[in-house]
Interface confidence: low
């Protein structure tokens, strides 16, 4: 049940041994009583005990004091338990008879004569207080207290609610007075089954089985799961969200592996020559005069550099050169010419004006040609006019930039990006190429928009050769070998001259 | 005293709507999640709605959920149910209660309770 109504009989007297008919009992009246608990009636009325009833063993004869007794026959205080919500009113029948018959029993022995009744109706709050009252009528009188109170596990102002400590699967938590739940250390909820984690752990990125723990999710990582993982292989980059690998500055491809500031990084040009950010390596050195080779470490001899103009031919000293000039020319480097507009020495369709009052002439050279007798054609590359890496070539009378991946435009100073329209699945990384967006897969997907779910690890037969580093999660076939200098192909098996600007996706 | 004082109930054609008050007295409000329960004729008690103490978390009966929106203002110790889309089977008088114990749909027993308003949909 949900409460017990408990009736402590205290003392009975009936001085005269009288019974409520005016008779008297023969020797004494043998006392027992029957108690009836029903709701709350304004007039009480004959009809079944609602609330519960309960009759006690012969108690004394006549006066009497009854003693507390917690068990067996006789029990004192009596209990009347109920289970429904107490609803705070009641009415209470205490009736005292005379019985000739068993002491034990003697609500079924006949002739059972009433000796009084009291009747008390009001209301009565759960709690652990006894109410204590004393009622006469002109023969008798009785002291008695009565109180309700809740049974284990039920809790309030009415008994109403159910309440069980627990400290498993389904909840941790003790009971409050009010029967509401307090939760254990370390649990939250409604029902205390959702443990507190870690202080401080994230709540997307983490998640706790058990109080004081913080688990990270796939792509997380630290004390608090506040620190994205970047993608397998990223060498120069960082992430805001898993798997990303945003490049550091001075740092690009695909892995943040490519030195974009080869030049400050390395100094790699020697002899005073000048180093650009370009070129299949990543950087390019123009030699000064004299000087030669990748790194312009290599000394030419002095005549290398052709200082003689105008068809002069060089000869080699110890620490110089001497030019030999050709007819009409004259000066050190051959610079000077006696010649004029009347000899023809304009090259390739130049115009000749004469200078000097006809002493000498200038030539003005069609496009495409240069020098002082237009006999040079342009190199149109060697104002570097490609950007962002883009690879000079000489195309007839023009010049076209070829540019590096994710670059267009005619000087390659456009950049394009396919990655706008979130073309990757699964939290795959986006990268701009020539012929379109690649993307770099997390852990466990591959396919070229990370669409194909793997559960093997495609790199681990060793499929590259040549040193080439392998990656998986890029393409259908799960790997991507991106390969050394000097090799290409799927698999880096080819040696080439010249390594491609991308490294082949298998 | 405790007091629980329900308002704002009437005769509804099917389709209108109405709006319940419940003013509280003589205990701290704010302290208590609060509820609604009705009861039809010749029917027990129906939980219709709760809310929590702070007014962020709210919960409905599967027959009222997206129909009636319950609210409660601290500062003004009431608590209010918006009713829409009214049909006859709301008819029923309406309590405010406070929730003591909870099922796994809502709340099941009640600590204090209104006297309650009659809201009677019919054309």
């Known amino acids: 049940g949900s409460g017990i109504f408990q009736l402590r009989l205290q003392e009975f007297v009936n001085q005269r041994g009288m019974l409520a008919n005016g008779q008297s009992c023969e020797p004494g009246c043998r006392t027992f009583f029957r108690i009836c608990l029903k709701h709350f009636q304004a007039t009480f009325s004959e009809g079944p005990c609602t609330f519960g009833n309960v009759s006690t063993p012969v108690l004394g004869t006549n006066s009497f004091v009854v003693r507390d007794k917690n068990s067996g026959s006789g029990r004192n205080p009596l209990q009347l338990p109920f289970n429904f919500t107490w609803p705070g009113t009641f009415s209470l029948n205490i009736q005292a008879w005379h019985t000739p018959g068993d002491d034990l029993r003697p609500e079924t022995s006949p002739g059972n004569s009433l000796i009084s009744q009291i009747i008390i109706q009001g209301s009565l709050a759960v709690g652990k207080i006894w109410r204590t009252d004393e009622q006469n009528d002109t023969l008798t009188r009785l002291s008695y207290s009565y109180r309700v109170i809740c049974s284990d596990n039920y809790y309030g102002e009415s008994c109403s609610r159910l309440c069980k400590k627990r400290d498993d699967h389904f909840g941790h938590y003790e009971c409050q007075p009010d029967g509401s739940l307090s939760c254990l250390p370390g649990w939250t909820g409604k029902y205390c089954d959702q443990p507190i984690c870690l202080s401080g752990c994230h709540e997307q990125n983490g998640y706790c089985s058990k109080p004081d723990e913080c688990i990270c999710r796939p792509g997380w990582q630290g004390r608090l799961c506040n620190e994205c993982i970047p993608h397998n292989g990223c060498r120069h980059g960082t992430c805001s969200i898993p798997w990303q690998c945003a490049c550091d500055e001075g740092w690009g491809g695909l892995f943040c592996d490519q030195d974009l500031n080869y030049c400050t990084h390395h100094s790699p040009c020697k002899n005073g020559s000048t180093c650009s950010n370009s070129g299949p390596k990543g950087y390019t050195c123009t030699c000064l005069p004299g000087y030669t080779g990748e790194h312009c470490e290599l000394g030419l001899s002095k005549c290398a550099s052709n200082p003689c103009r105008n068809g002069g031919s060089c000869k080699d000293q110890e620490n110089s050169y001497h030019c030999l000039c050709p007819p009409g020319y004259y000066g050190q480097h051959c610079e000077h010419s006696t010649l004029t507009c009347a000899d023809s020495p304009c090259f390739n369709g130049g115009s000749c004006r004469e200078r000097n009052q006809g002493s000498s002439y200038a030539c003005e050279c069609p496009p495409n040609f240069t020098g002082s007798n237009c006999e040079k054609k342009v190199d149109r590359c060697t104002s570097n006019p490609c950007a962002n890496g883009g690879q000079c070539q000489n195309r007839g009378p023009s010049r076209t930039c070829r540019c590096r991946p994710g670059f267009t435009g005619t000087h390659c100073e456009l950049h394009i990006s396919d990655c706008a329209r979130s073309p990757c699945a699964h939290g795959g990384t986006c990268h701009d190429l020539e012929n379109g967006p690649v993307c770099t897969c997390p852990a466990g997907f591959s396919g070229r928009r990370c669409e194909v779910r793997i559960t093997h690890d495609a790199c681990a037969s060793g499929p590259c050769f040549n040193g080439a580093t392998c990656y998986t999660g890029l393409s259908p076939n799960n790997f991507v070998c991106n390969c050394p200098y000097g090799f290409v192909g799927s698999r880096c098996e080819f040696p080439v001259g010249l390594p491609p600007s991308f490294p082949w996706v298998a | 005293e405790v007091q629980l004082v329900e308002s704002g109930g009437g005769l509804v054609q099917p389709g209108g709507s109405l709006r319940l008050s419940c003013a509280a007295s003589g205990f701290t409000f704010g302290n208590y999640d609060m509820s609604w329960v009705r009861q039809a004729p010749g029917k027990g008690p129906e939980w219709v709605s709760a809310?929590?103490?702070?007014?962020?978390?709210?919960y409905y009966a599967d027959s009222v959920k997206g129909r009636f929106t319950i609210s409660r203002d601290n500062a003004k110790n009431t608590l209010y149910l918006q009713m829409n889309s009214l049909k006859p089977e709301d008819t029923a008088v309406y309590y405010c209660?406070?929730?003591?114990?909870?099922?796994?749909?809502?709340?099941?027993?009640?600590?204090?309770w209104g006297q309650g308003t009659q809201v009677t949909v019919s054309s």
């Open positions: 809310i929590n103490s702070g007014g962020g978390d709210t």
């Open positions: 209660a406070t929730p003591r114990g909870w099922g796994p749909t809502g709340p099941h027993e009640y600590g204090y």
